[in-house]
């Protein structure tokens, strides 16, 4: 079998709401993946599991099941949404995200995604991790790749 390539493209949109009294931020983050099937047979994207971390704390998880079938030598773009909550120990972020004196309220989030594909009864998992900027101060739609956070030192290979 040839490879199945998973490419995390980036954040597509982030929709924000607040709980004023509980100083809580709700961020619905939609991400985009490109999944390429380099085989001469179809593969099924069985599930996508994703989680989002802020400051080493998991703030959101999502799982999508029975997503799609990708035909031979084909590529599909898949969007998935992770609902996240920034609260309690991190409620100090509420002040930053709602500060009206600044225009962009970017926070750095780590996006983790695992794609499980199956073909002929065989299962394969591919994982990706990316740091992304997300504006927690307003609803934002991003050009693909626009939210990439490049200034984080990646561990040496």
């Amino acid at each position: 079998p040839r490879s199945i390539d998973v490419k995390y493209i980036g954040v597509k949109s982030a929709y924000v709401s607040y709980d004023v009294q509980k100083r809580t931020i709700y961020l619905n983050i939609t991400n985009t993946l490109n999944i390429t099937n380099n085989n001469y047979y179809s593969v099924e994207v069985e599930n996508i599991t994703a989680q989002v971390q802020f400051s080493k704390t998991v703030i959101g998880k999502a799982r999508l099941n029975n997503i799609t079938i990708i035909g031979p030598l084909d590529m599909k773009q898949i969007d998935y949404t992770v609902p996240t909550v920034i609260a309690e120990e991190m409620s100090y972020m509420y002040d930053f995200c709602t500060l009206i004196s600044i225009k962009v309220h970017n926070i750095v989030l780590m996006m983790q995604v695992t794609v499980t594909t199956t073909y002929f009864g065989h299962s394969e998992q591919i994982s990706q991790e990316r740091y992304q900027y997300v504006d927690c101060g307003r609803n934002t739609t991003y050009q693909l790749g626009q939210s990439e956070y490049l200034n984080v030192l990646q561990p040496q290979q």
């Epitope: 607040y18 004023v20 009294q21 509980k22």
Partner: antibody
Framework: QVQLQQSGAELAKPGASVKLSCKAS????????MHWVKQRPGQGLEWIGY????????KNNQKFKDKATLTADKSSSTAYMQLSSLTYEDSAVYYC??????????????WGTGTTVTVSS | DIVMTQAAPSVPVTPGESVSISCRSS???????????SYWFLQRPGQSPQLLIY???NLASGVPDRFSGSGSGTAFTLRISRVEAEDVGVYYC?????????FGGGTKLEIK
Amino acid sequence: QVQLQQSGAELAKPGASVKLSCKASGYTFISYWMHWVKQRPGQGLEWIGYVNPSSGYTKNNQKFKDKATLTADKSSSTAYMQLSSLTYEDSAVYYCAREGGSISDWYFDVWGTGTTVTVSS
Amino acid sequence: DIVMTQAAPSVPVTPGESVSISCRSSKSLLHSNGNTYSYWFLQRPGQSPQLLIYRMSNLASGVPDRFSGSGSGTAFTLRISRVEAEDVGVYYCMQHLEYPYTFGGGTKLEIK
């Protein structure tokens, strides 16, 4: 119906500790934060802090930071407040209060029966 | 901390008449979302407090519509029309916007 039943009156000596309980019934305990409020005899109300029964996270009024420890037991749907190093100023009625409502629209909709704490030597 | 001030420690009223109880906050409780986070509670003699009004003007469940709340960002009024004997007790305003939550000192409603 929704009820908060608090433990009975406490008589304690200065320097001692007491643990007050607030048993919730008639609703899903972990879905609502539980607050504690102090009322000294003939005086007004003072917010002590809250516990989130779902996560165990607590937030205290700075004034009660070293005085009150808030906890919750999910299995028994009971919130607790421990008062330590008691002084005469701690003599008061203590109420638990549920914070009901929904996002950005919360309020103390149900109050406990109150527990009287008397500090006396 | 936000200070809630109830200037009148007590207000005398004749049954059947109307009465207004006022409260001021040291900081505006009007949030940019349009909500004003002031609240009113009644504590009858020997009882626990009960919620009357939330978000300045919303009547809590089970509370008679003789009670109403109004105000601005820093000045709040609880109005009781056609006062009844069961309305006696201490009325507290509260701010539910910023920690620590704070209450007014209370206003005692007394029947003449």
